[in-house]
Interface confidence: low
């Protein structure tokens, strides 16, 4: 499995998606686990509903949620209020009995908030204002591979 990188901004939410063959994994529950070291075990963080038919219901463990679109074949994990310690290697898994198939290996990267936690204001173009104002930040955008609402640089 190749590792897919998902980048999020500290303090915001990050959404990780794991596509899979819905027929091949029909009837199987899914899980999200954190890889402990390169060769170590994958420690379960959260798994989908015990009843497969209710997999679409979002289940939380702390700030991590999981939901499964079993028809479309997409497992979605949401990491809320992303923090530097959330960075690391994870796996999306398909469970069958005591076994687990890896659907996707995921590297979560946590980027510093360019606004340094100042209040979000508006972004100005030259001529609109003489002074710099903070860029607007959406605090609930989640994307992979730089696909987040990254605050725009300051302008004068």
């Amino acid at each position: 499995h190749n590792t897919t990188v998902f980048q999020g901004v500290a303090g915001q939410s990050l959404q990780v998606s794991c596509p899979y063959d819905s027929m091949k994994h029909w009837g199987r529950r899914k899980a999200w686990c954190r890889q402990l070291g390169e060769k170590g075990p994958c420690q379960r963080v959260v798994s989908t509903h015990n009843l497969w038919l209710l997999s679409f219901l979002r289940r939380w463990n702390g700030s991590t949620a999981i939901t499964d679109d079993t028809l479309g074949g997409t497992l979605t994990i949401t990491l809320r209020n992303l923090q530097p310690h959330d960075a690391g290697l994870y796996q999306c898994q398909s469970l069958h009995g005591s076994e687990a198939d890896t659907l996707r290996k995921v590297l979560v990267e946590v980027l510093a908030d360019p606004l340094d936690h100042r209040d979000a204001g508006d972004l100005w173009f030259p001529g609109e204002s003489e002074s710099f104002e903070d860029a607007h930040v959406e605090h609930s955008i989640s994307r992979s591979l730089l696909e987040g609402e990254i605050p725009f640089p300051p302008t004068s």
């Epitope: 340094d116 972004l123 030259p126 994307r143 609402e149 725009f152 640089p153 300051p154």
Partner: antibody, heavy 118, light 112 residues
Amino acid sequence: EVQLVESGGGLVQPGGSLRLSCAGSGFTFTDFYMSWVRQAPGKGLEWVSVIRNKANGYTAGYNPSVKGRFTISRDNSKNTLYLQMNSLRAEDTAVYYCARLTYGFDYWGQGTLVTVSS
Amino acid sequence: DIVMTQTPLSLPVTPGEPASISCQSSKSLLHSTGKTYLNWYLQKPGQSPQLLIYWMSTRASGVPDRFSGSGSGTDFTLKISRVEAEDVGVYYCQQFLEYPFTFGQGTKVEIK
């Protein structure tokens, strides 16, 4: 996979108009600032225009060299960015790239060539 | 407008050897947030530019670690620790501090 595909380039006479399009896919279009950057034949890169995202009201900004002649817009229902170019001059001849903005121009289209000549 | 000046304009390199490109801005790109709004791009022959480095020293996703950026508020350097054949092309620095965003003239890197 993020993809940007430009179209609409071609040959136009000085003083004429042209509209470029850029179709985006693989990302949530409304969340992002989008921009146009151009490159004259054999020359370097020049930033042309930017349009902000939904959170910032889709406001536009322009390089002084094109302000008043070019208009950037977006149709979010079609995930498409536009550049309406009026009163074209010979010095506007360039490959026009659309690019997505995050920390910089992180994804670029393949470019579309605009030639202004009589 | 902020003027970006690159040196050299042409850089013949030997695969496996290091290479360095300089960029100077007419105004400090260091903002009070502590971020330096300087980016580096590579435009390979016949291709669109690609983002290499942002915030002066942070590698963009997927960029090999042989590329590194450094500098102060007005003087910046892009270093390639060991040049590979695929690194040929034109390198541009760009200021992202204020409008209009401006690029350097470009440095053409080619194999000797």
